[in-house]
Interface confidence: low
């Protein structure tokens, strides 16, 4: 018996062009939820085959509404783990299917609409009781980051959770770090690998990376004698000497991280975040120094007096990152206003402004019509950063300087004759046709083919079109 656990870290647009901006359709806000399906074995199974090892559904995530101008973010996720309990043996090899579903919250007839957004399938080998396995998978244009593990529950042990281990109160002939198992009480079960350095005599673990102490011992590796301890409310198998256990300290007690590293607890273990220049499980190894020249792009390296001390890169303008290895994309902040084009020249930013705008950031809106006279009685119309002339009849062109012959385009249909007029043009229609452009035939019975007569006029009434 045991449980498979899945933790979704992030779901969002993958890298590269064409990444979607929003998981929601145009119909409005939506929220995400996940479904996990476990199938035994590594074979390529049909998508419809049952989730023989179990399945689970997450809660709904927070409502997401797309911000039109904002960059596409990692999307808000449901809280908590997805847990798939299994009653029988853990198979070791399995197929993991994670589906990301969208619940649309627009005005749907009959309630919310669900649609499958992404589906990833991983065929994996995984022993129960092991550490969290991290993974990143792409599904189309989406990227999913997640961790998973299988752990035994109750008294089950082993990589398949098939063996039952009964804690015994009597002293055991098993060696240090080994525990007796039932029903085969003369067999010793090898425990998982404890935290490195965990005392074999005074410590034990039930999960990898853990170190819990026997009565009378303390410290992250159970190497420090404890002055006093109580046996009240203790859990875990009894000690062969005193019949009780003290629970081990938290993984970060006493800060196992050297060289100023900060400790954070992880399931059953700890993780050190090391300062610059140090690495290793406990930040115990001094790695990169200024002597290695780790600062790129003209960054200035500053180290301590000790040759093995950490380094800090002071980056020149336009670069960032712990090694000044990343060029700052200063245009990503969209400093150019009014649609100006941003150019990062390295030493400076330059905005190339659209017509009608000026200034270092295109912030000044020029008077589009200032100093722009429209000839021949035309009027200047401002808009969109460029001036436009609305020309008087008979004139055209950008500044109304060109003479326009209104009859040049032969606007009168069906053989009508065109006459240029001070207010435009007039069509003299051939017999049997009417309309401002002679476009409508007049029927022999006097009823025109106009789709609808203007108010106050009946089809067939004489009409004058200018």
């Amino acid at each position: 018996a045991g449980v498979f656990e899945l933790q979704i870290h992030s779901f969002g647009p993958g890298p590269g062009p064409g990444a979607p901006r929003s998981p929601c359709s145009a119909r409005g806000p939506c929220r995400l939820f996940f479904r996990v399906c476990l199938k035994p074995g590594l074979s390529e199974e049909a998508a419809e085959s049952p989730c023989a090892l179990g399945a689970a559904l997450s809660a709904r995530g927070p409502v997401y509404t797309e911000q039109p101008e904002a960059p596409a973010p990692d999307l808000p996720l449901p809280n908590g783990l997805l847990q798939v309990p299994f009653r029988d043996a853990w198979p070791g090899t399995f197929s993991l299917i994670i589906e990301t579903w969208r619940e649309e919250l627009g005005d749907q007839i009959g309630g919310p609409a669900w649609s499958l957004l992404a589906r990833v399938t991983r065929r994996r080998r995984l022993a129960a009781g092991g550490p969290w396995a991290r993974d990143i998978q792409r599904a189309g244009a989406w990227e999913l980051r997640f961790s998973y593990r299988a752990r035994c529950e109750l008294l089950a042990v082993g990589t398949a959770c098939t063996r039952l281990c009964r804690p015994r109160s009597a002293p055991s002939r098993c060696g240090p770090g080994l525990r007796p198992c039932a029903p085969l009480e003369d067999e010793c079960e090898a425990p998982p690998v404890c935290r490195a350095g965990c005392s074999l005599e005074h410590g034990f673990c039930e999960q990898p990376g853990e170190c819990r102490c026997l009565e009378g011992w303390t410290g992250p590796l159970c190497t420090v004698p404890a002055s006093t301890s109580s046996c009240l409310g203790l859990r875990g198998p009894s000690s062969a000497t005193t019949g009780c256990l003290v629970p081990g300290p938290g993984p970060c007690d006493g800060n196992p991280c050297a060289n100023g590293g900060s400790c954070s607890e992880t399931p059953g273990s700890f993780e050190c975040t090391c300062p610059r220049g140090f690495y290793g499980l406990r930040c115990e190894v001094s790695g990169v120094t200024c002597a290695d020249g780790p600062c790129f792009n003209g960054g200035l390296c500053v180290g301590g007096a000790d040759p093995d001390s950490a380094y800090i890169c002071h980056c020149p303008p336009g670069f960032q990152g712990s090694n000044c290895e990343k060029r700052v994309d200063r245009c990503s902040l969209q400093p150019c206003r009014n649609g100006g084009l941003c150019l990062d020249l390295g030493h400076a930013l330059r905005c190339r402004c659209r017509a009608g705008f000026a200034g270092p950031r295109c912030e000044h809106n020029l008077d589009d019509c200032a100093g722009r006279a429209c000839a021949n009685g035309g009027t200047c119309v401002e808009g969109g950063g460029a001036h436009r002339c609305s020309c008087a009849l008979g004139f055209g062109g950008r500044d109304c300087r060109e003479r326009a012959d209104p009859c040049a385009a032969r606007p009168c249909a069906h053989g009508g004759r065109c006459y240029a007029h001070f207010s435009g043009l007039v069509c003299a229609c051939a017999p049997g046709y009417m309309g401002s452009r002679c476009e409508f035939p007049v029927h022999p019975d006097g009823v025109s083919a106009l789709p609808a007569a203007p108010p106050g006029l009946r089809p067939g009434d004489p009409q004058r079109y200018l």
């Epitope: 890298p15 991290r134 993974d135 990143i136 590293g261 050190c272 975040t273 090391c274 300062p275 610059r276 220049g277 140090f278 690495y279 290793g280 930040c283 790695g287 790129f296 792009n297 990152g321 712990s322 090694n323 290895e325 990343k326 060029r327």
Partner: nanobody, 118 residues
Framework: QVKLVESGGGLVQAGGSLRLSCTVS????????MAWFRQAPGKERQLVSL???????VYADSVKGRFTLSRDNAHSTAYLQMNGLKPEDTAMYYC????????????WGQGTQVTVSS
């Protein structure tokens, strides 16, 4: 989980060349700063070369001009081209990786042995 697999080590005569490869799985390679360290028997582990996510590299003084570190994001692999090898380059060579948001090299390969005979 993140896995680094090195290859390309071996025995070579002084003045010869080798190309070490380090292939990464389980993580987006583009987001990793890659490095090669080496450790000779009885000596401290030392940085040989480091290549940032942008592709620019730094080298230990002892290998400058002879070693070239490059990365092939499409194949999730970092290559250390070693020319003009010297007996003092003999060591176990380890590939290491870290994300570009932290400073500790958290991911390590098993190492590949390079032996340069005179």
């Amino acid at each position: 989980q993140v896995k680094l697999v090195e290859s390309g080590g071996g025995l070579v005569q002084a003045g010869g060349s080798l190309r070490l490869s380090c292939t990464v799985s389980g993580f987006t390679f583009d987001d990793l700063v890659m490095a090669w360290f080496r450790q000779a028997p009885g000596k401290e582990r030392q940085l040989v070369s480091l290549v940032a996510t942008a592709g620019n590299s730094v080298y230990a003084d002892s290998v400058k001009g002879r070693f070239t570190l490059s990365r092939d994001n499409a194949h999730s692999t970092a290559y250390l081209q070693m020319n003009g090898l010297k007996p003092e380059d003999t060591a176990m060579y380890y590939c290491a990786a870290r994300t570009d948001s932290e400073h500790a090299f958290k991911f390590w390969g098993q190492g590949t042995q390079v032996t340069v005979s005179s």
